[in-house]
Amino acid sequence: MMTGTIETTGNISAEKGGSIILQCHLSSTTAQVTQVNWEQQDQLLAICNADLGWHISPSFKDRVAPGPGLGLTLQSLTVNDTGEYFCIYHTYPDGTYTGRIFLEVLESSVAEHGARFQIP
């Protein structure tokens, strides 16, 4: 029996050098969210604890910003940021809910096709 549902931004794309907001939303449950962990594949990016607030992993401090809300903002995107991201909600009394987002970082269209738009 699964009571809650996680809605995510799903599959998203963004341009290299830009930023993107990763968002998850837990609905259909009255459970209390005690902590949300954000992971990139097999790396912990950030933790938002209901009592202690945000902690960003040191290796991502320069490029990851907390929020908005329980979401996460990735900045200065590189092609290496392409991949799976997981929001992991720990709740009381239900347990743990996990959402998945796939991010594809594309080469900047301006950089790629810049010559086409040059004014003679």
Partner: nanobody, 127 residues
């Protein structure tokens, strides 16, 4: 094929302790949802404790209200083993204890539906 084998059950006086173990084979995912359930005679099987872990370092344990503060679920990743440490046992904790694993990690909690089950180990607490 996932296989779960429990051990550690037995008889104990009220107030005593037991530690159950569950060795898993064939369950090698980067995200895992495992749990302990129990069934007393004439009653439905109920969730006791669950553990969500990921290779990214997330470790979230969840407990039924009836055991919170007395039972602790933990793991030894290297041994593919999950444990249930049971302290201050009460006669109402008696029953067959089952280890379980869930394929999907979209939800991991005592009320989740689990896919794989062990054969169970008997715990008897006398007053």
């Amino acid at each position: 094929q996932v296989q779960l084998v429990e051990s550690g059950g037995g008889s104990v006086q009220a107030g005593g302790s037991l530690r159950l173990s569950c060795v898993a084979s064939g369950y090698t995912y980067s995200r895992k949802c495992r749990g302990w359930f129990r069934q007393a005679p004439g009653k439905e099987r109920e969730g006791v404790a669950t553990l969500y872990t990921s290779s990214g370092g997330t470790y979230f344990d969840t407990y039924a209200d009836s055991v919170r503060g007395r039972f602790t679920i933990s793991q030894d990743n290297a041994k593919n083993t999950v444990y249930l440490q049971m302290n201050n046992l009460k006669p109402e904790d008696s029953g067959i204890y089952y280890c379980a694993a869930r394929l999907s990690t979209d939800f991991c909690g005592p009320r989740a539906d689990f896919d794989y089950w062990g054969q169970g180990t008997q715990v008897t607490v006398s007053s």
